[in-house]
Amino acid sequence: MEMEKEFEQIDKSGSWAAIYQDIRHEASDFPCRVAKLPKNKNRNRYRDVSPFDHSRIKLHQEDNDYINASLIKMEEAQRSYILTQGPLPNTCGHFWEMVWEQKSRGVVMLNRVMEKGSLKCAQYWPQKEEKEMIFEDTNLKLTLISEDIKSYYTVRQLELENLTTQETREILHFHYTTWPDFGVPESPASFLNFLFKVRESGSLSPEHGPVVVHCSAGIGRSGTFCLADTCLLLMDKRKDPSSVDIKKVLLEMRKFRMGLIQTADQLRFSYLAVIEGAKFIMGDSSVQDQWKELSHEDLEPPPEHIPPPPRPPKRILEPHNGKCREFFPNHQWVKEETQEDKDCPIKEEKGSPLNAAPYGIESMSQDTEVRSRVVGGSLRGAQAASPAKGEPSLPEKDEDHALSYWKPFLVNMCVATVLTAGAYLCYRFLFNSNT
């Protein structure tokens, strides 16, 4: 198969970073004026991830129709998706208003609420104990009807009620709970099993509005999910897998939302998923059972509050010249959250050579990108960057990855400093008390 050959060749030559960089430079760039309005500052999770004006979802609200969400309309595949950021505490009502107004049946969540010790998303659906949530700003009520917890994903049946009209709708919440804190899933089996679960539910059928897909910024993992689904759909429609060009499809998708697929690693994983998924599309129905087996969905899920331990960093393939984020005091910025798809500020010049590691070029061990989380104020110490067209202007290198890479060294330094300081203080204390 063409795609498989291409995959092997890129793997062999180690050129995923270069290919990913080409995509980033070719990507569309459109205005995001509404997203940048001062009144919408607190409706954006990350300063540099905004919906394009032409494809943004508009809430049916007179005072402010803005939500950080984009409609991705794939004409040939005849599939539409709404990609959105993980809801903020102040936008949960807007999120469900969008689900209601767009007549969506499915919500796909690809992150955990808490990852790597920081909040990636508000708790926007009711947990068992609470049973229901009322969003007074949009006059909607959300009830948890049932929950099917598998080892690596959970499917929730929710009931969304418009309190004004008392109309209700069943919403299916597909929550992929085991995307690793660093990098991408080890194999595409569990991811494909999850994708096909969403498909089988009818949530993607034209009877309903577009499925709502989110991670933290709604561009990395979310892009991966939609890219894989669209490519597999096109393969099915065309009956000729070799005619599907993943890069072209991704560039088409990037006309609707910036930054889809945030790392070279995610791009590589998308290829893997499509290559594996194509086996099923081309008539090998046994592979679906294999995915199910390989994904061990019926095992006990890991405890939700204990995130999987970060993988130790692999050998860095690209020089990692990122500077880690500054600490912002006084909560002007509510922590520059790392997000499932984000990275550390790294200066990028438009024509920078690959070995200068422009932001977004990933070592094969990570997929997280830092996004500046906005509430107010400005980013101090951020370097001037000339980003790729249509690309988020702040980085995609993982600050947590950088920290984990240096952690042993830093810990030793800290311990040595503390011990030295302690010894010095003891000495001073003893010396002073003797005189």
Epitope: K103, R105, T143, I145, Q157, E159, E161, N162, T164, T165, Q166, E167, T168, R169, E170, G202, S205, E207, H208
Partner: antibody, heavy 117, light 106 residues
């Protein structure tokens, strides 16, 4: 194609009971709220009852409260209306309707209920 | 309960005419107003929902407007198949219908 097919209507004596069914097809039944609307011969339309998508919430017109019970079986794609203590004024064609976007967007062909001695 | 008053209750018109039917709510219902067409012996059919949105498959000669308490259904150029009874309905529980407007051939 969305289809709603009512059954269970007929002639019943005042004070009697009847159970109407509505078989749904061509759409994801469990996603939608459903309703019953009736129309007395030569008269206008009157909303009777609605039920939430999960079946957990119900509402009724004052004229039938305490006598009629709406229910659904999502596994069978079927909506029901249990009618007890029937009165002459309940005589009507009963329509099953899908309640979506605050409107009755699809209707069945109706089943006639006649309450007479 | 919210009362819906439709006018006129009956109306004679010719093919090609522009026809307007009005509906008034006893209190504000925002845009929760729908219009239905019913032919003798048939189930009602949704034409317009949310005051002005055209239901899929409905000809564009039908249009709706209004919000709050006053609403209008307009048929821009009457066709032979449009002669029927029209009902408005408000979408705030308990849901109520107007008494209907019978549109007849002149």
């Amino acid at each position: 194609e969305v289809q709603l097919l009512e059954s269970g209507g007929g002639l019943v004596q005042p004070g009697g009971s009847l159970r109407l069914s509505c078989a749904a097809s061509g759409f994801t039944f469990s996603y939608y709220s459903m309703s019953w609307v009736r129309q007395a011969p030569g008269k206008g339309l009157e909303w009777v009852s609605s039920i939430s998508s999960s079946g957990g919430g119900t509402s009724y017109a004052d004229s039938v409260k305490g006598r009629f019970t709406i229910s659904r079986d999502n596994s069978k794609n079927t909506l029901y209306l249990q009618m007890n203590s029937l009165r002459a004024e309940d005589t009507a064609v009963y329509y099953c309707a899908r309640w979506f976007s605050s409107a009755f967007d699809y209707w069945g062909q109706g089943t006639l209920v006649t309450v007479s001695s | 309960d919210i009362q819906m008053t439709q006018s006129p209750s009956s109306l004679s018109a010719s093919v090609g005419d522009r026809v307007t039917i009005t509906c008034r709510a006893s209190q504000s219902i925002s845009s929760y107003l729908n219009w239905y067409q019913q032919k003798p012996g048939k189930a009602p059919k949704l034409l317009i929902y949310a005051a002005s949105s055209l239901q899929s498959g409905v000809p564009s000669r039908f249009s709706g407007s209004g919000s709050g308490t006053d609403f209008t259904l307009t048929i821009s150029s009457l066709q032979p198949e449009d002669f029927a009874t029209y009902y408005c309905q408000q979408g705030v529980p308990p849901y109520t219908f107007g008494q209907g407007t019978k549109l007849e051939i002149k």
